[in-house]
């Protein structure tokens, strides 16, 4: 037996006009100890009792896991990175079967030297990170590598990766049409070949907030949505104040419920309250109570 | 550790001659790429020559058809013939080395170098 601790109580009456009893403490406990029925039960919406207490599932809250929260948290990574997967061919060094080790003194040298050379033409680009060379293979040596970017999370990061990535081909195409090779001979760094420069791939991290919210609010996911505050993502429904989005319940309080956000509208000991936004105040009208 | 060291460097006539030495240890010498360069007074590094591990050969225009480079693989050294010198010729001449079989006379594609020997061309 489950024993409910009388409190205060605040009359609330529906947007369609029913009356509504809610507790305005949220303490109905039980008052014994010892586990008596099915306590499993009493935590709604996959909720689990854990021997003390309801522990609730996003996007719900509450004793009983049936009230359902205002904003769920969603957290972008700090930073967002892309991978392009590029070969050039470098025509100053001639290749070599040590070349062909990744733990040969040859490879570290020439890794060195082609990453330094990268880090020059890449100069320029805030997001460029550095290379990492995958492949030497024969002719004279064609060099498959990663050019990493990386930038941080805001919510036009794809726009900024995907303008980085056309300045790395700008770049690449630059050095690889003017660093050629002279009478055998080359002046610079390192010489290329022209038309040996390929952009395999580009990967870009997926991250949409919008998507989380969605996934996290579960059923409610049509009435969830993502409002940005100092470039930061927020998932919220509409009874979560202070963003664009948010409800005005004037005299009331929001409730989510399966078809979305509505207002419970307050009686007062002068006037009550109607309305779908509970702005529509009528006063009661005034009777003398005899003591 | 690699260690290259350079010698024969002095005080020669115009037209005389030298020969520098560089002897290498800790350097595969049958491998890679072994160069000169030259440092004159307040100006740049320069190349003035390399020698790859096949024998292939490259020179500066300047030093063209005057200087030789060849190596001893049997010694680990590097060697530079220099004939028919000339006072602008004088510089800080420097060994380098590099694992890699290269084909440039950019100082930073080597990562070894010896501590320099001097040569000057004056009456």
């Known amino acids: 037996p489950l024993a409910t601790i009388p409190v205060s109580t605040t009359s609330l009456t529906s947007s369609e006009g029913s009356t509504i009893s809610t507790p305005s403490v949220d303490i109905s406990t039980p008052v014994t100890t010892s586990i008596v029925g099915d306590q499993c039960s009493r935590c709604k919406n996959g909720g689990f009792w854990d021997g003390l207490k309801c522990q609730c599932l996003t996007p719900y809250y509450g004793e009983s896991c049936e009230e359902v929260v205002n904003s769920i948290d969603i957290a972008p990574p700090e930073t967002v990175s892309a991978q392009m997967e590029l070969t050039v061919t470098v025509t100053s060094v001639k290749f070599t079967d040590e070349l062909k080790n990744h733990s040969s003194q040859e490879f570290r040298e020439f890794n060195k030297t082609f990453t330094e050379q990268m880090n020059i033409v890449y100069s320029g680009i805030p997001e460029y990170v550095g290379v990492n060379i995958t492949n030497l293979r024969l002719g004279s040596v064609v060099v498959e590598h990663d050019v990493l970017l990386r930038t941080k999370y805001t919510p036009e990061y794809k726009t900024a990766l995907d303008n980085a990535t056309e300045v790395v081909k700008q770049k690449i195409t630059k050095v690889t049409t003017e660093q050629i090779m002279t009478n055998d001979n080359c002046s610079a760094l390192m010489c290329f070949n022209t038309t040996g420069t390929q952009v395999q791939n580009i990967t870009v991290t997926q991250y949409d907030p919008v998507e989380e919210c969605r996934q996290k609010a579960e059923e409610y996911e049509d009435y969830f949505l993502v409002e940005y505050r100092d470039q930061k993502p927020y998932c919220i429904s509409p009874c979560e104040s202070g963003f664009n989005a948010s409800k005005n319940c004037n005299h009331g309080k929001c409730q989510m419920s399966q078809n979305g956000a509505r207002c419970l509208c307050v009686t007062t000991e002068t006037h009550w309250y109607s309305g779908e936004d509970c702005n529509q105040g009528t006063q009661k009208s005034h009777h003398h109570h005899h003591h | 550790d690699v260690q290259l060291v350079e010698s024969g460097g002095g005080l020669v006539q115009p037209g005389g001659s030298l020969r520098l030495s560089c002897a290498a240890s800790?350097?595969?010498?049958?491998?890679?790429?072994m160069a000169w360069f030259r440092q004159a007074p307040g100006k740049e590094r320069e190349g003035v020559a390399f020698i790859n591990s096949d024998g292939r050969t490259s020179y500066a225009e300047s030093v063209k058809g005057r200087f030789t480079i060849s190596r001893d693989n049997a010694k680990n050294s590097l060697y530079l013939q220099m004939n028919s010198l000339r006072a602008e010729d004088t510089a800080v001449y420097y060994c380098a080395a590099s694992l890699l079989y290269l084909m440039t006379v950019n100082a930073a594609a080597y990562p070894y170098w010896g501590q320099g020997t001097m040569v000057t061309v004056s009456s």
């Open positions: 800790g350097f595969p010498s049958s491998r890679g790429t």
